[in-house]
């Protein structure tokens, strides 16, 4: 089935996007799967629907599980998975690899490390980063929009970085980290 | 009612060009992605191009890139196919189609078609 | 590109006769694989989309499965002017591909 992996933090914010995309002017309905329960829409839930996306605001352990998207346009309606899993923040340092994005390479002439998922989210600069949990410091760093950009690149910097920031929505804020890890390869 | 309704189809020798046309009625149309898909007599459908709504980006089968050239009017709401440098394997029946639901970087079905509009490349 | 199968390529059954027709294709489309009809001298007609969606105004007696590699389509029971040829279509990506087509003709 059309269905996308998506995860989180208990009491961080995460939105999911359903996987199935139309056209701005369809509507999209959201479902419990298992219940084939319609998730709200109305702001004040906790969990409610807009649009093409599907908000935690904030995420608890207990909304993991699969949700349905139908997206309807006059004539067809096409049906989407997210399958959601939210797990409760780590006491120590480590990243555990469930919750890591996607590997990123880079090199001494090109050194983004893009945060993963933030263009779901209403958030505003600066982001920041940390790597192996610690606040990164130095000229060599620069959080550039969705970006963090590393000068002079050298094997020591490989390792796993965390981007957080700030989701608004409403004028509530909501804690979003996402982290990933980065590999140097030679030129 | 969707309407697409192509001309410019005919007898043509090989080397030739032909330029097709598929007039839209019934929708939006620079909002739909539109289409070509040729039959060669009893065969089977091959797709030949397609053409984003308002971005216009296009795309086009292995067998005909770089001879042909998909566009679009949309203040005409018309579609056409600039096929050059043809080939007695060009030869079919060339309908268009509309995509009613695709978004940038994917691809849906052709719900309504055209009735067909009849090429044939030979000396 | 994707290559698209159809088996058979010919069915020959009578009115009132369930037709199963299979479409394989060389890689996953997940569901990304619709139907169409064709009759002689006319344009294709959708008739699935989704592997298993009916398109607006398409009789119940059309179903289709499947997902990934291995796709259905069923008529339970077959009326005289569903005698046409039938093609499987993949749209998860470029270039967009179709089956070589099942001939569904009458017995």
């Known amino acids: 089935k059309f269905s996308k992996q998506s995860w989180g933090l208990e009491n961080e914010a995460l939105i999911v996007r359903c996987p199935r995309q139309g056209k701005p002017s369809y509507t999209v309905d959201w479902y419990y799967s298992q219940t084939n329960k319609s998730i709200p829409t109305q702001e004040r839930n906790r969990v409610f629907a807009s649009g093409q996306l599907l908000k935690f605001l904030p995420a608890a352990v207990e909304d993991s599980g699969i949700y349905t998207c139908i997206v309807r346009s006059p004539t067809f309606n096409r049906t989407g998975y997210a399958n959601v899993t939210i797990y409760k923040k780590q006491s120590d340092c480590n990243v555990p690899d469930y919750l890591m994005y996607s590997t990123v390479s880079g090199s001494e002439k090109n050194s983004k490390i893009y945060c993963p998922t933030i263009d779901l989210y209403n958030w505003t600069a600066p982001l920041e980063w940390f790597k192996n949990c610690q606040a990164l410091q130095g000229s060599r760093y620069r959080a550039h929009k969705s970006f963090l950009v590393i000068d002079n690149v050298m094997t020591e910097d490989a390792g796993d970085y965390t981007c957080k920031f700030i989701h608004n929505e409403n004028g509530a804020n909501y804690s979003v980290t996402a982290t990933r890890s980065f590999t140097v390869k030679d030129e | 009612e969707v309407q697409l309704l192509e001309s410019g189809g005919g007898l043509v020798q090989p080397g030739g060009s032909l330029r097709l046309s598929c007039a839209a009625s019934?929708?939006?149309?620079?909002?739909?992605?539109m289409i070509w898909v040729r039959q060669a007599p009893g065969k089977g459908l091959e797709w030949v191009s397609s053409?984003?709504?308002?971005?216009?980006?296009?795309y086009y089968a292995d067998s005909v890139k770089g001879r042909f050239t998909i566009s679009r009017d949309n203040s005409k709401n018309t579609l056409y196919l600039q096929m050059n440098s043809l080939r007695a394997e060009d030869t079919a029946v060339y309908y268009c189609?509309?995509?009613?639901?695709?978004?940038?970087?994917?691809?849906?079905?052709?719900?309504?078609w055209g009735q067909g509009t009849l090429v044939t490349v030979s000396s | 590109e994707i290559v698209l199968t159809q088996s058979p390529a010919t069915l020959s059954l009578s009115p009132g006769e369930r037709a199963t027709l299979s479409c394989r294709a060389s890689?996953?489309?997940?569901?990304?694989l619709a139907w169409y009809q064709q009759k002689p001298g006319q344009a294709p007609r959708l008739l699935i989309y989704?592997?298993?969606n009916r398109a607006t105004g398409i009789p119940a007696r059309f179903s289709g499965s499947g997902s990934g590699t291995d796709f259905t389509l069923t008529i339970s029971s077959l009326e005289p002017e569903d005698f046409a040829v039938y093609y499987c279509?993949?749209?998860?990506?470029?270039?967009?591909?179709f089956g070589q087509g099942t001939k569904v003709e009458i017995k």
């Open positions: 053409i984003r709504g308002e971005g216009g980006g296009t």
């Open positions: 989704d592997a298993s």
């Open positions: 279509q993949q749209y998860i990506t470029a270039p967009l591909t």
């Open positions: 189609a509309r995509d009613p639901w695709s978004t940038e970087g994917s691809f849906f079905v052709l719900d309504y």
């Open positions: 019934g929708f939006t149309f620079s909002i739909y992605d």
């Open positions: 890689q996953s489309v997940d569901d990304d």
